[in-house]
């Protein structure tokens, strides 16, 4: 004959544990039902009656099977530099992530506690490491034969155009200027692999809360006005 299925509440066999979605109530010394996600224990079980569950109130939640007396409070509303990527429901907490052009400077278990604007590299500097969801942009000087004339959180240093006749030579913050003949971008001159000396060591402007572009969190960025900066899977 098959073993009889026990209904909650029931006393467990000595040395055995309660089944899945059940918990052992120390007071009643019985295996009792847990409450499903989105609910909490309104009345705990006794030797003769099972747990009584009730739905979570607005702005509260439980994510797991539980026997908590009160649901957890959802986090506060997302701030202006954040986007709500998961709404507060009876079964899940609100998740706030940083909006484009910002990164998470202080994370919490899920989502972000504090967002900060991505650093912008000033002219003569390019994005050596892009910003990700959790890390700021790293700016470094342009190498010889390359330049960046923008203040940007996404632009890398791009090669100078090659002129048949140079009107003004390029430098770290300015492209070469050619005389009337058409330029090419086939190859930047010189083969040394070093940054241009820069008079000031400050590598970026102060972050501002109005990023000029959506961030690229890719390692390298598009050249010139070609395709828009891409997003990254981050780190």
């Amino acid at each position: 004959l098959p073993a009889q299925v026990a209904f909650t509440p029931y006393a467990p066999e000595p040395g055995s544990t309660c089944r899945l979605r059940e918990y052992y109530d120390q007071t009643a010394q019985m295996c009792c039902s847990k409450c499903s996600p989105g609910q909490h224990a309104k009345v705990f079980c006794t030797k003769t009656s099972d747990t009584v569950c009730d739905s979570c109130e607005d702005s509260t939640y439980t994510q797991l099977w539980n026997w908590v007396p009160e649901c957890l409070s959802c986090g506060s509303r997302c701030s202006s530099d954040q986007v709500e990527t998961q709404a507060c429901t009876r079964e899940q907490n609100r998740i706030c992530t940083c909006r484009p052009g910002w990164y998470c400077a202080l994370s919490k278990q899920e989502g972000c506690r504090l967002c900060a604007p991505l650093r912008k590299c000033r002219p003569g500097f390019g994005v050596a490491r892009p910003g990700t969801e959790t890390s700021d942009v790293v700016c470094k000087p342009c190498a010889p034969g390359t330049f960046s004339n923008t203040t940007s959180s996404t632009d890398i240093c791009r090669p100078h155009q090659i002129c048949n006749v140079v009107a003004i030579p390029g430098n770290a913050s300015m492209d070469a200027v050619c005389t009337s003949t058409s330029p090419t971008r086939s190859m930047a001159p010189g083969a040394v692999h070093l940054p241009q000396p820069v008079s000031t060591r400050s590598q970026h402007t102060q972050p501002t809360p109005e990023p000029s572009t959506a961030p690229s969190t890719s390692f390298l960025l598009p050249m010139g006005p070609s395709p828009p900066a891409e997003g990254s899977t981050g780190d």
Epitope: G126, A128, S148, C157, H193, L194, P195, P222, S232
Partner: antibody, heavy 118, light 107 residues
């Protein structure tokens, strides 16, 4: 002209720790991010991590995270890579590589051979 | 991790001919791919960055193309000094990963 000059070859026993240096000359080390890349004999390249010497911020590859420490001394323009709990499969050439505002590894050291053998 | 697969493993071409090397990413990496050349006993050196930007001082016979998951390095007229191993590298997401390399040898 910039140069990345690495320390000499090392022979280590399993379980030991190795520390390799990478001296940047010609320009300030803070003008770069410094990456470390492993190349096992006859194998491809494997990224280990990087350091920004300006603020000592680091990023490590998950495979090496528990055993590698990358540091930099701005007073001597030198970066270091320390790999602990060495095993035979760590026998490889280790490269440092510099990353400027182009966003690529545009200058490399000559490599340091580390041999792990009992 | 993003896997970069290079093909062929070995490519035999005569000097003066064209060589086409392929690199495929296991997921979309946009245009975040670099190509490196390595000769025996030497360190790698960058040829192409951001999929198609030729690095400072690299001859015009080297060109890169592609985006998303498929990338190509083309050497238009092979010189004797071009016979080496070529690696592609993605930098879209961490960890940064390299292809296993294509050995370009003289036919």
């Amino acid at each position: 002209e910039v140069q990345l000059v690495q320390s000499g070859a090392e022979v280590k026993k399993p379980g030991a720790t190795v520390k390799i240096s990478c001296k940047v000359s010609g320009y300030s080390i803070t003008d770069y991010l410094l990456h470390w890349v492993q190349q096992a004999p006859g194998k491809g390249l494997e990224w280990m991590g990087w350091i920004d010497p300006e603020d000592a911020k680091t990023k490590y590859g998950q495979k090496f995270q528990s055993r590698v420490t990358i540091t930099a001394d701005t007073s001597t323009d030198t970066a270091y890579m320390e790999l602990s709990s060495l095993r035979s499969e760590d026998t490889a050439v280790y490269y440092c590589a510099a990353n400027s505002g182009t966003g690529t590894m545009d200058a490399w050291g000559q490599g340091t051979l580390v041999t792990v053998s009992s | 991790d993003i896997v970069m697969t290079q093909s062929p493993a070995t490519l035999s071409v005569s000097p003066g001919e064209r060589a086409t090397l392929s690199c495929k990413a296991s997921q979309n990496v946009g245009s975040n791919v670099d190509w490196y050349q390595q000769k025996p006993g030497q360190s790698p050196r960058v040829l192409i960055y951001k999929a198609s930007i030729r690095y400072t001082g690299i001859p015009a016979r080297f060109s890169g193309s592609g985006s998303g998951t498929e990338f190509t390095l083309t050497i238009s007229i092979l010189q004797s000094e071009d016979f080496a191993v070529y690696f592609c590298m993605q930098s879209k997401s961490y960890p940064i990963t390299f292809g296993q390399g294509t050995k370009l040898e003289i036919k």
